[in-house]
């Protein structure tokens, strides 16, 4: 069962007291059938809300939208509709925030009817908007340079891409028939067109492009493109082999100049290709099987993002809908968490420690019985719900949560036994990066970190009656503390926090509803009360992180460093603070083979740390396609994995020569590749059909 | 296996100070906190302080605030208690303790240094 | 600081008894207590942490429980080596303090 709230449990004196004085109700006198929020810049307490309501009348949509604005987190809120002309502003993508602490925002407003459109844009964090016509009307959310906020790129309903160097004062087209388009670094934009004017049904016939100017000069870098992604350092395109149908991944680290076949599968037109995560040292890819299976294999990347091992097999990735359950744990170094299709057809959750090499089962909670789904009562794992689990239905209010400054911390909904449970979920949290768990919470709940993990809060999922309460850890989860924020309960929608986890407020968003009547209410809850001092360095303990064996020299060892951190005792009721910075110290590690992947042509026989010689390859020179040169392969199977910084102990030796010979895939070389100058080619317009999951780097 | 070594036992005049030292093998040094901890002849246990020597942290009880000094040199594994102004009743057994692992068992001390007796007589 | 009192301050019991010594903290310590067992001139050994978590190496005979003020530690049948000093000690807030010990004799 999950910790009791009993009075003795980590009991925070006179709390109620203490939040009833810092409990912020505002109503918002609207009707509106939705509600969308956005903090505008980080530390500056600026929200933005914005409430749409729509009818669909005949052939179009008659909308009505207002606009509200606060600056102290929440706890009030001011109409500033009257500063964009009371003009509708659409939900879908209506509010794009600038990168950074730029305080620039953008609302794109909906003029039925019309062959442009109009924004309204602030430089100032909201306070104040000017009302700029577009020669347009954008397909997507206006898109940020995030290297200069003042230059914005949009793409149009013909497909054509426009640009503005003045943060949207004035606008050039800069191509037509532009199917994707994105921004890299340095203002670099990437994007891929097609000359025959349709991106839907030409999809492998896609030219892809690049300017580093603005628009004044173009390069072609790829053609026969079916999609492109880019991830950390990576610039990765999907490309149409020639044989037939079949597509191959080719990686490029210099923005497209150069490109080197990716050592992955080829796949058909029904397959896919997903970037699940990446940084500037690797990549994880997801590579669809054959047929509708709905699954596919995890390959990791070398630092190059060229040779791939194989990282986890029937990795679970929908193509109905594109749903991964891939979850990055940001609270910890190497740290990630997925599902897998078992043979039973089962879901099953899986977990790694070092960013791919190995994956396991999750440790089922000591204080936690297998269900009904365990062979055996005794063994078992836990499951984590995610994104599939909220695709099937299942009541999961929210994906798992990890928060960077909050170390070692996960938050996730699960259950135990031998796979993914349909019955309800119950919330469990680990505080050492997912190597532990322990139940939480009995039953579904929203749930966000607070004051860099000083405080979790939690709110129950109740869909068919009102909520009233509120339940608060100031222990990791350990103990919760229930409060009563209101007398008379409220339709629940959603909690918000300012992303970042460095606030120490928490906005309860709902509905009150009657006969006759609907309105908006939130409710702000300021911990700093909860919190009453500053922490101190006596709050503080050391943590190394990875531990599994204190005997051992290497313990903690992971990607070649182990890291201490100080990190807040549980017992302390303390504020992190706003400006809190994690304090961790590196200590590097003696290499072992763990700490190399297989080389090119060579592969780890399962529960083996030796690389061995592929069998097809034995006795072959190992000669690849690399940066459009082949290169001869001298190696005894070994190469570091990237981010590794492990020194001495085992060294494998490589070598790598260049034979002087060119060679291409079925990409343009880069001595055929072409410039032209700054002219709009003809087309018209299509889909694009690539999507950003969420977390997802990039999926065709 | 891993060993906490004390220095051998001393004998003060009041007034003076001593150093105790807590040498440790096995494990890495640097992952842990060390805490003092000494007893009185056929009393209890107190707690003195707490060092973390990789990012060297040192907290004292307010009792011995002001008296109590722990260092420790991260190159020879080795952690240090210097208590001055001696006075008779400071006549005990002193030990060090490192913490246990893990984070829901900091302060729990798992191992312990065999202990040092420091007499306080004139 | 958080005072610990242990009851009996000491005890006569014979193999196979069970025994229970208590603990009761001067404030709410939520589960961040430990016990300890310690014989004539040897140092303490950790036997439970967090109110009810068995060290490991120690025999299933010796359990924790409680939350709060007051908590309690069994010896569920008493073995020749059991009989020493426990102490219990809170590391909610510093300063970390110990009970003042239980003497387990033999009767």
């Known amino acids: 069962s999950a910790p009791g709230e009993d009075e003795e449990c980590g009991r925070v004196r006179d709390f109620v007291a203490k939040l009833a004085n810092n409990t912020h109700q505002h109503i918002f006198n609207d009707l509106s059938g939705s509600v969308s929020l956005s903090w505008v810049g980080d530390s500056t307490g600026v929200i933005l809300v914005l409430t749409t309501f729509q009818v669909p009348i005949f052939m179009i949509t008659i909308g009505q939208s207002k606009l509200y604005r606060s600056e102290d987190y929440g706890k009030n809120f001011k109409d500033i509709t009257d500063l964009i002309n009371n003009t509708f502003i659409r939900s879908d993508f209506g509010i794009a925030i600038g990168p950074e602490n730029s305080g620039k925002v953008v609302l794109t407003a909906d003029v039925s009817g019309s062959h442009g459109s109009r924004i309204f844009r602030s430089s100032d964090f909201a306070k104040n908007f000017v009302q700029q016509e577009l020669p347009f009307v954008p397909l997507m959310q206006i898109m940020y340079s995030p290297q200069n906020s003042d230059y914005l790129l949009a793409l149009s309903n013909k497909n054509e891409l426009w640009v503005s160097k003045n943060f949207g004062g004035k606008w050039e087209k800069l191509y037509d028939t532009v199917c994707l388009a994105k921004w890299g670094s340095d203002n670099t934009i990437f994007f891929t067109a097609n000359h025959n004017g349709s991106c839907s049904n030409d999809r492998g016939m896609l030219e892809l492009w690049r300017t580093s100017d603005l628009g004044k000069s173009f390069k072609t870098i790829g053609s026969k493109i079916y999609s492109f992604g880019l991830g950390g350092r990576f610039l990765f395109a999907s490309v149409m082999t020639g044989k037939g149908t079949l597509r191959a991944i080719h990686v490029s680290t210099d923005q497209g100049d150069t490109w080197s076949m990716a050592q992955l599968p080829p796949v058909g037109h029904e397959q896919f290709y997903s970037i699940l995560a990446a940084n500037d040292d690797m990549v994880f890819m997801h590579v669809d099987e054959p047929g509708d299976s709905g699954f596919g294999t995890i390959f990791t990347s070398d630092d190059r993002g060229i040779v791939y091992s194989k990282s986890l097999e029937r990795h679970l990735y929908t193509t109905t809908g594109g749903e991964t359950d891939f979850t990055n744990v940001t609270s910890l170094r190497g740290v990630y968490i997925t599902s897998i299709l078992a043979e039973d057809k089962s879901v099953q959750s899986m977990i790694t420690f070092d960013q791919g090499g190995r994956w396991t089962h999750l440790r089922k909670p000591e204080n936690s019985k297998c269900d009904a789904t365990a062979r055996d009562p005794e063994k078992c794992s836990l499951h984590i719900h995610a994104a599939y689990s909220i695709a099937t239905g299942l009541n999961v209010p929210m994906l798992p949560l990890s928060e960077p400054n909050a170390v070692g911390i996960v938050i996730a909904h699960g259950s135990v036994g031998d796979a993914i449970s349909v019955m309800r979920p119950d919330v469990y949290i680990s505080d050492d990066g997912g190597y532990s768990w322990t139940k939480a919470l009995e039953g579904p709940h929203h749930y966000t970190i607070l004051d860099s993990g000083g405080i979790i809060v939690a709110v129950e999922q109740n869909a068919h009656q009102g909520v009233n309460q509120i339940k608060f850890s100031t222990d990791e989860g350990q103990c919760w503390q229930t409060y009563n924020f209101t007398k008379d309960p409220i339709f629940f929608t959603g909690l918000a926090s300012e992303p970042g986890a460095r606030s120490m407020n928490i906005s309860i968003w709902g509905y009150r509803s009657s006969l006759f009547h609907q309105y908006w209410i939130s409710y702000t809850i300021d911990f700093k009360d909860i919190l009453e001092r500053n922490c101190e360095e006596k709050d503080y303990t050391i943590w190394l992180a990875h531990s599994t064996d204190p005997e051992d020299y290497e313990d903690g060892c992971i990607l070649g460093y182990k890291e201490q951190f100080l990190r807040l005792r549980k017992s302390s009721v303390c504020q992190n603070g706003r400006d809190y910075v994690v304090t961790k110290q590196p200590s590097i590690c003696l290499c072992s083979l763990e700490d190399f992947l297989c080389d090119f042509g060579y592969y780890r026989p399962e529960n083996d740390s030796k690389c061995v010689e592929q069998p097809e390859l034995k006795g072959h020179d190992l000669e690849f396609c690399l940066y459009g040169r082949e290169e001869h392969l001298t190696t005894n199977g070994y190469r570091k994995i990237p981010g590794d910084k492990c020194q001495g102990g085992v060294n494998p030796v490589r070598e790598v020569k260049d034979l002087k010979k060119k060679c291409t895939s079925n990409f343009l070389s880069p001595e055929k590749q072409n410039s032209k100058s700054n002219g709009s080619a003809g087309g018209s317009g299509g889909l694009n059909d690539i999507f950003e999951a969420q977390k997802i780097e990039w999926h065709e | 296996q891993v060993q906490l070594v004390q220095s051998g036992a001393e004998v003060k005049k009041p007034g003076s100070s001593v150093k105790v030292s807590c040498k440790a093998s096995g494990g890495t040094f640097s992952n842990y906190a060390i805490s003092w901890v000494r007893q009185a002849p056929g009393q209890g246990l107190e707690w003195m302080g707490r060092i973390i020597p990789i990012f060297g942290i040192a907290n004292y009880a307010q009792k011995f605030q002001g008296r109590v000094t722990i260092t420790a040199d991260k190159s020879t594994s080795t952690a240090y208690m210097e208590l001055s102004s001696l006075r008779s009743e400071d006549t005990a057994v002193y030990y060090c303790a490192r913490d246990r692992r893990g984070f829901s068992g900091y302060e729990v001390f798992d191992y312990w240094g065999q202990g040092t007796l420091v007499t306080v007589s004139s | 600081d958080i005072q610990m009192t242990q009851s009996p301050s000491s005890l006569s019991a014979s193999v196979g008894d069970r025994v229970t010594i208590t603990c009761r903290a001067s404030?709410?310590?939520?589960?961040?207590l430990a016990w300890y067992q310690q014989k004539p001139e040897k140092a303490p050994k950790s036997l439970i942490y967090?109110?009810?978590s068995l060290q490991s190496g120690v025999p299933s005979r010796f359990s924790g429980s409680g939350s709060g003020t007051d908590f309690t530690l069994t010896i569920s049948s008493l073995q020749p080596e059991d009989f020493a000093t426990y102490y219990c000690q809170q590391y909610n807030s510093y300063p970390i303090t110990f009970g003042q010990g239980t003497r387990l004799e033999i009767k």
């Open positions: 404030q709410g310590i939520s589960s961040w």
């Open positions: 967090a109110t009810s």
